[in-house]
């Protein structure tokens, strides 16, 4: 009779957990049986992030450090089942920890919006479009941001309106602006659980224009028109 290695109950093992689980939480378990009925000892291999520990007797797997989906998911480690006594034969399977995203990244502007301008004086109210993003994973739909002005004092001069889940329009409420830079604060809410807000600043310059660009003395670059 040839001694056989332990046999895992499944081809691979997977578990889904929220990335913000408390340290010490049971995140999964593996099981194997030995054909000869010997006891089995479980161990982990390749836990490069140092996130997990396994109970050598039960095969239960616990978190031992904070988990971070942005580091890569699923997180894959090898599980080894070794027979205790006998020939100490072992088998290898895999445990995949699927990290479900927690809303932990506030919204931000999708790109650099320096250089926005309107030609002064305004002949009619103007507007510009901007885009928001964040670094969270949006599994079942794209982001659904809402937009508002960052302070009440801005409401006399500006209004912000949502175009879709990622884009909004910033518009002037009148034409009586000074020839200078205005910093418009925008509040972006991601509607997540928990909801996170980012306050971003859009610098908008009102300037004299030459051929559709901000006039600048020699040595200054022209701004780009976004109106």
């Amino acid at each position: 009779d040839v001694n056989e290695a332990p046999q895992f109950s499944q081809h691979v093992f997977q578990a889904k957990v929220s990335e913000d689980v408390a340290i010490g939480t049971k995140v999964g378990n593996v099981t194997a049986k030995d054909p000869e009925g010997l006891d089995i000892s479980y161990s982990l291999r390749g836990d490069t992030r140092g996130w997990l520990k396994i109970d050598h007797v039960t095969g239960e797997i616990f978190s031992v450090a904070p988990l971070d989906r942005e580091a890569g998911s699923p997180y894959r480690v090898q599980v080894v089942a070794t027979e205790v006594g006998g020939s100490s034969l072992s088998s290898v399977s895999e445990f995949h920890l699927i990290l479900m995203d927690v809303n932990d990244n506030p919204p931000r502007l999708a790109k650099d919006y320096t250089g926005l301008f309107f030609c002064h004086p305004l002949s009619a109210p103007g507007s510009l479009i901007f885009e928001a993003t964040d670094d969270d994973q949006h599994l079942f739909r794209g982001p659904h941001f809402t937009f508002s002005l960052g302070s009440g004092s801005l409401q006399n001069d500006w209004e912000v309106s949502k175009i879709n889940g990622t884009h909004a329009r910033l518009s002037t409420r009148h034409t009586e602006f000074e020839e200078r830079e205005y910093v418009v604060l925008i509040r972006i809410n991601d509607g997540g659980r928990p909801p996170l807000e980012g306050i971003v600043s859009l610098p908008v310059t009102f300037c004299s224009c030459v051929e559709g660009s901000c006039f600048r003395p020699a040595g200054h670059k022209h701004h780009h028109h976004h109106h």
Epitope: H11, G46, P74, R76
Partner: antibody
């Protein structure tokens, strides 16, 4: 980037053997199991087995157990699948695929035609 | 062996339509399920794993649901590039098996 490049099409006579290769690049070869599937004309995908390149452990579908051999060459990051005693119903496209939860990367496929 | 039964075997739909494909396992596979898209002459592409988790780079119009023995792939708004064959596959234990596939065609 991860790539699995398979050997070219083969035409074989019934009773012969075929050996298909799958060269991996762009990742740590020994760290992922490699599976083989096949798809006969007008049929679905059929799993043939897998090899763990780090240990050379193999597990085969019972249907092919007596005819299939999977091997791995770590020095060239290549896995091989040899199927013997070929018959006409073995005519199919054979795929290697890297294992994760499901198969996240596949080779381009190798057409094996068995015809007298 | 665990049998995977996919339905429908073929489906005609238009761009913009919402489409649902179902997959039933002959026993509980505890969400050890993947979905693939396969176009002629190309390698299959992994769409979802663990029944509901979208593979990196796959558009969010694809989603998965289900548990136990019954699973669903949904495409919320069909795009021209989505016309292909779709397969489910379990990886609960060997032998791994696939559904027979659903051919999604343009109406």
């Amino acid at each position: 980037q991860v790539q699995l490049v398979q050997s070219g099409a083969e035409v074989k006579k019934p009773g012969a053997s075929v050996k298909v290769s799958c060269k991996a690049s762009g990742y740590s070869f020994s760290s992922y199991w490699m599976h083989w599937m096949r798809q006969a004309p007008g049929q679905g995908q059929e799993w043939m087995g897998y090899i763990n390149p780090s240990t050379d452990y193999t597990e085969y579908n019972q249907k092919f157990k007596d005819r299939v051999t999977m091997t791995a060459d770590k020095s060239t990051s290549t896995v091989y699948m040899e199927l013997s005693s070929l018959r006409s119903e073995d005519t199919a496209v054979y795929y290697c695929a890297r294992s994760r939860l499901g198969f996240d990367y596949w080779g381009q496929g190798t057409l094996v035609t068995v015809s007298s | 062996d665990i049998q995977m039964t996919q339905s429908p075997s073929s489906l005609s739909a238009s761009v913009g339509d919402r489409v649902t494909i179902t997959c039933r396992a002959s026993e509980n596979i505890d969400s050890y399920l993947a979905w693939y898209q396969h176009k002629p002459g190309k390698a299959p592409k992994l769409l979802l794993y663990a029944a509901t988790v979208l593979e990196s780079g796959v558009p969010s119009r694809f989603s998965g649901s289900g548990s136990g023995t019954d699973y669903t792939l949904t495409i919320s708004s069909l795009q021209p590039e989505d016309f292909a064959r779709y397969y489910c596959q379990h990886y609960y234990r060997t032998p791994l098996t696939f559904g027979q596939g659903t051919k999604l065609e343009i109406k």
